[in-house]
């Protein structure tokens, strides 16, 4: 471009409006200059001289900007804000400038590459208020590179509900050093806060799901990423539409409340017209749709003094519909009175028709309290089957399915003989019902038992009626820790009962969460989709009430007789209240020690432990045949053994395998196999390992993603499952109590010695395994396999199971052979030679025994030869 001098009008001195100030780059001493720069070069002359600038690390506080005119910090005007040295990302309609989302396959074996779908589309997805991770087995990385002028911080909020996703956050700085390895593992949902060094920093949010049982994982959600230390700001930013800043010096703009709106840079929000509405943080108001019957719900009032309740109709909150529009429905008239249902069992009706708990030592069916007769104790718990008001230890709320904030709404409404999910603000809201139990108190008459861990149980009857993809989650949380999902029901489920066993005496919260649809869209289309709970029964609750009394063992004292615990393994004689030891080879039914019939016989090949709480095998077994008795000793197999299934690959090429741990016998029946979820472990702060999900059983299974795949120090193990909690029996039969150990699953035995099968059951009842899981361990005598021998999985079902519910193992070992006895060797007597006769012993071939008696030494006896006798 060409500059022509001396032609045209003379340049005028620049006015303030025609130039702005900038800083030069920092020099090596950390200094810089403030220089004036014209908006349009060549328009004017006589710019102010450069002056020394503030030091390079100088910055203003949040709510201020650097006024370059006098290089001082000034407060932002109303309707504007500044982060001082920061930037914030709180809108995720699209990936903000500077962010990158990458994806990669973790480990794709060449041999399976044809079946591997590629990962190019598995990325973090912006979803308005937040950004959501992938949910498949690809690794998706969200990256942001930033240059900090001074040390700063990054903080962000995240929602991380699902341990079948590995979620890590780490930073690489100028020296390419990642942040400390052990801090990169994200804990459960909270706010993340990491310090950043001056200079270049690359922030990484990385997720990998590995849901290998075709369960779709819940994505990690990240929002409100704020980074400080970026640079000074020489201007304040106008509040975005839907927000406002009423005061000078605002570090952020506040959201407009519901039914208000604002434009860009506003100092206040404006109310919507009466026929319009808006959600919190809106830039416009929307017209109200006509009300439909989906916009209201019904509930019952508390009982009045006359023992009557009113049916009440209420608009779902927030009420966004217009009832005055043509075609709109109006709220049906409330006030129809009906008789109140009875009180719940263990409660009684007061004079003013409220329900109060019966005092300890008494029981009720919901009407009057009756003292427990002598020789009995109250069976304390909570049985809720009438729903006129929400019990005092239950609460309900609504969690937004869009931004995962609690809405302060009622999620479930009482309806007489059931409680049901109310209308949410949106169909993907989680309608949450929580029952908190302070602790448990097993009956006086039952002694604690280390192996039979049942402390209490919760049983509830429910149904779901759904037109689309609704989900009902049942979750359990111990001692205020994060709820762990125990079971999920999808779609319509007929009225049914579900029981969960509590194995730890702790404060427990039980949570039911119902989501009408998992789709990420607002609106009420499916409000007729509903979950109903008819009854909830929790046993052995500390501070609970009783609906009946049970017999107890009596103990004489100065004040008469009182209930006491029977010694371990003793049942209570109902008539006399005395304790009697269960017979040998029987165990006592947990929490029901009444009468001789409470002693349940052990299965074949098992015996009771010392306290008659479980049947176990003491590593011995006897097999009778017409010709002899075969005795076995499996002590060499008493330790825990592990076995990995063959590697598998998910559709995205993630390599994983099932890992099994087994403990067979001995140890007084103590379960020795432990499987741990170390994804959760990696998320746990030191000293809180109690949160880690581990399973202890006779046989357990875990999914392993090997270390070479994940690139972490150890492989990742996840989703531990118990496959065997109870030994049903030991037998040479193929079937025992409905458990089948098909012999054809393994190569045939050839020795003629029948396999000995251990039959186990698991307590875990799931929808897919309605009878629970079972496990069989087939012990096969193989003299060639030194103890402990080798474990195999079925050749055609390499994950140990052909149906997901029944697991089978073959254990070949010399230790599985019968103990050697005199029947297992030959005796050879030599002829008399030189007055000596030798008796030699040799094992029969093939030798199919182990241990037991040793082969006798050769015996030498004096004999007289035949010619002596002839003489």
């Amino acid at each position: 471009f060409q500059v022509t001098l001396g032609t045209g009008p003379e340049l005028h001195a620049c006015k303030e409006s025609e130039y702005h100030f900038e800083y030069t780059a920092c020099d090596s001493t950390g200094s810089r200059w403030r220089v004036a720069v014209p908006h349009s070069p060549g328009l004017c002359t006589s710019l102010p001289d450069p002056v020394k600038g503030t030091e390079c690390s100088f910055s203003c506080n949040a709510g201020e900007f650097l006024d370059m005119k006098d290089q001082s910090c000034k407060p932002c005007a109303e309707g504007r804000y500044s982060l001082g040295t920061g930037i914030r990302f709180d809108e995720w309609d699209e990936l903000p400038h500077g962010f990158a989302s990458l994806s990669a396959n973790l480990e794709v074996d060449d041999s399976i590459s044809e079946s591997t779908e590629n990962c190019t589309s598995s990325k973090w997805v912006p979803r308005g208020d937040y950004i959501a991770s992938n949910t498949d087995e690809c690794t998706a990385t969200l990256m942001y590179a930033v240059n900090l002028k001074q040390s700063g911080t990054v903080n962000f909020e995240y929602y991380y509900p699902d341990s079948s996703i590995i979620f890590e956050f780490f930073v690489q700085n100028d020296q390419c050093q990642p942040s400390a390895d052990d801090s990169r593992w994200m804990k459960t949902t909270e706010k993340g806060w990491v310090e950043l060094n001056r200079g270049n920093n690359v922030l990484y949010w990385r997720t990998t799901a590995f849901s290998v049982w075709s369960k779709v994982s819940k994505p990690v959600l990240v929002r409100n990423i704020a980074i400080t230390g970026v640079a000074y700001t020489s201007e304040c930013f106008p509040c975005k539409p839907g927000t406002y800043a009423a005061k000078q010096g605002s570090p952020f703009c506040k959201l407009c409340p519901a039914n208000y709106y604002s434009n860009k840079g506003e100092t206040s929000c404006h109310p919507c017209d009466a026929d319009k509405y808006s959600e919190k943080g809106s830039s416009t108001c929307k017209v109200r749709p006509a009300c439909t019957d989906k916009d209201y719900f019904y509930t019952h009032t508390a009982c009045d003094a006359q023992g009557e309740t009113q049916l009440m109709y209420k608009w779902a909150i927030p009420k966004i519909c217009g009832e005055d529009l043509e075609g709109a429905v109006k709220l049906p008239a409330s006030g129809v009175k009906t008789r109140c249902p009875p009180c719940n069992p263990g409660f009684f009706k007061t004079d003013n028709s409220t329900c109060e708990p019966c005092p300890y030592g008494s029981y009720s069916n919901g009407s009057d309290c009756t003292h427990c007769p002598a020789g009995t104790e109250p069976a304390v718990g909570f049985e809720y089957k009438w729903w006129n008001t929400l019990p005092s230890n239950m609460e309900t709320t609504v969690l937004s399915g869009i931004n995962f904030e609690y809405k302060g709404l009622t999620g479930w409404e009482v309806a007489g003989d059931h409680i049901y999910t109310a209308v949410g603000a949106s169909d993907n809201d989680f309608m949450i019902l929580t029952l908190v139990v302070p602790g448990f108190r097993p009956p006086q008459s039952v002694v604690a038992d280390t192996e039979n861990k049942e402390v209490a149980r919760i049983t509830f009857v429910f149904e779901t009626i759904c037109s689309v993809n609704c989900e009902l989650y049942f979750m359990v949380g111990m001692n205020s820790r994060t709820n762990t999902p125990v079971e999920t029901w999808k779609g319509t489920k007929g009225k049914q009962s579900y029981t969960y066993t509590i194995e730890e005496n702790a404060t427990v919260s039980f949570t039911w969460a119902f989501q009408r649809t998992t789709l990420h869209e607002t609106g009420r289309k499916y409000t007729n989709d509903v979950a109903k709970i008819y009854s909830i029964n929790v046993t052995n609750v500390m501070g609970g009430v009783a609906s009946y009394c049970r017999p107890c063992a009596l103990e004489a004292s100065d004040l008469g007789s009182s209930c006491t615990s029977c010694p371990a393994g003793h049942y209570i004689n109902r008539d006399s209240g005395t304790c009697h030891l269960c017979p040998s080879n029987t165990i006592l039914k947990a929490h029901q020690p009444y009468g001789a019939q409470a002693c349940v016989p052990c299965g074949p090949g098992t015996k009771n432990n010392k306290i008659h709480s479980l049947c176990y095998n003491d590593c011995t077994f006897s097999r009778n045949t017409p010709s002899r008795i075969f005795n076995y000793n499996f002590s060499a197999l008493a330790g825990t053994v592990s076995l990995a299934g063959v590697p598998s690959f998910t559709s995205k090429g993630l390599k994983y395998f099932h890992h099994f741990t087994l403990s067979l016998c001995g140890n007084q029946g103590k379960k020795m196999a432990v499987c741990t979820d170390n994804v959760t472990d990696l998320r746990i702060p030191d000293g809180e390992a109690g949160f880690s999900k581990s399973v202890t059983a006779y046989v357990c299974q875990v999914v392993i993603i090997p270390s070479e795949v994940m690139g972490y120090k150890a492989g990742v193990s996840s989703q531990p499952v118990s496959l065997a909690d109870r030994l049903v029996g030991v037998s040479t039969d193929m079937t025992l109590e409905g458990i089948v150990s098909p012999v054809e699953l393994f190569h045939p035995e050839t020795s003629g010695i029948p396999d000995i099968v251990f039959f186990f059951r698991s307590n875990d009842v799931t929808q897919s395994c309605s009878s629970g899981r079972s496990t069989t361990i087939r012990l096969r005598c193989n003299p060639m396999k030194a103890a402990p021998g080798t474990l195999r999985l079925p050749s055609m079902c390499s994950d140990g199971t052909c149906d997901g519910c029944n697991f089978h193992f073959l254990w070949e070992s010399v230790a599985a052979c019968p103990l050697c006895s005199a029947s297992d060797y030959h005796t050879f007597v030599s002829s008399c030679v030189a007055g000596i006769q030798k008796t030699t012993y040799m094992w029969r071939e093939p030798k199919l025994c182990s241990g037991g008696i040793s082969l006798p030494e050769q015996r030498v006896t004096i004999c007289k030869t035949i010619d002596f006798w002839l003489k």
């Epitope: 026929d275 319009k276 017209v287 749709p289 006509a290 217009g322 009832e323 005055d324 529009l325 043509e326 075609g327 109006k330 709220l331 008239a333």
Partner: antibody
Framework: EVQLVESDGGFVQPGRSLTLSCAAS????????MSWVRQAPTKGLEWVAT????????NYRDSVKGRFTISRDNAKSILSLQMDSLRSEDTATYYC?????????WGQGVMVTVSS | DIVMTQSPSSLAVSAGETVTINCKSS????????????LAWLQQKPGQSPKLLIT???TRQSGVPDRFIGSGSGTDFTLTISSVQAEDLAIYHC?????????FGGGTQLELK
């Protein structure tokens, strides 16, 4: 200022068709339900049809169901009434009206005469 | 459908008089949820289109003279015009908007004696 201006009506034979239109101005058209109301000579007012914010809600009086179709073009702020199989009893002055709940603004009306 | 019955069908008055027009609905127009009556009054001068006078049974629209007073609740409603003026000569219609379809009364013709 809110204005509703109907197109010219006319004389039509029984069994024939006619389309009425109504141009709206002075308000955000898409924010309102709209209706057609008619008045036969020397008779009272009679609601004919309503349309919601968009085509997802329409409603008709029983005697015109299947013969009349109400529609709207929110981009052009135009309300229409397509009248087919006209009968002599459809003879009336037709008004378009803004309809938040009650009818708060009315057009000047257009006369439709159905006669052989 | 809700049937609206107006009486009288016509009325001759002198300027300055007070007139009362009645409207009866076949079912209650009172909605307990918001304590409102869903009734409007419209005025239709000769050769003109109807004009909204009163909503919610008693709320005057802006610009409507205060000599027009709506009253009543449930099923019985009244429009009172005190000190009738010559420009008030018109047909007066009541209309319910409680339910769909919206229905009108037969109209009351106000004439000068």
């Amino acid at each position: 200022e809110v204005q509703l201006v109907e197109s010219d009506g006319g004389f039509v034979q029984p069994g024939r068709s006619l389309t009425l239109s109504c141009a709206a101005s002075g308000f955000t058209f898409s924010d309102y339900y709209m209706s057609w109301v008619r008045q036969a000579p020397t008779k009272g007012l009679e609601w004919v049809a309503t349309i919601g914010y968009d085509v997802s809600y329409t409603n008709y009086r029983d005697s015109v169901k299947g013969r009349f179709t109400i529609s709207r073009d929110n981009a052009k702020s135009i309300l229409s009434l397509q009248m087919d199989s006209l009968r002599s009893e459809d003879t009336a002055t037709y008004y378009c009206a803004r309809h938040p709940s009650y009818f708060d603004y009315w057009g000047q009306g257009v006369m439709v005469t159905v006669s052989s | 459908d809700i049937v609206m019955t107006q009486s009288p069908s016509s009325l001759a008055v002198s300027a300055g008089e007070t007139v009362t027009i009645n409207c009866k609905s076949s079912q209650s127009l009172f909605y307990s949820e918001n304590q409102k009556n869903y009734l409007a009054w419209l005025q239709q001068k000769p050769g003109q289109s109807p004009k909204l006078l009163i909503t919610w049974a008693s709320t005057r629209q802006s610009g409507v003279p205060d000599r027009f007073i709506g009253s009543g609740s449930g099923t019985d409603f009244t429009l009172t015009i005190s000190s009738v003026q010559a420009e008030d000569l018109a047909i007066y219609h009541c209309q319910q908007y409680y339910d769909t379809p919206r229905t009108f009364g037969g109209g009351t013709q106000l004439e000068l004696k």
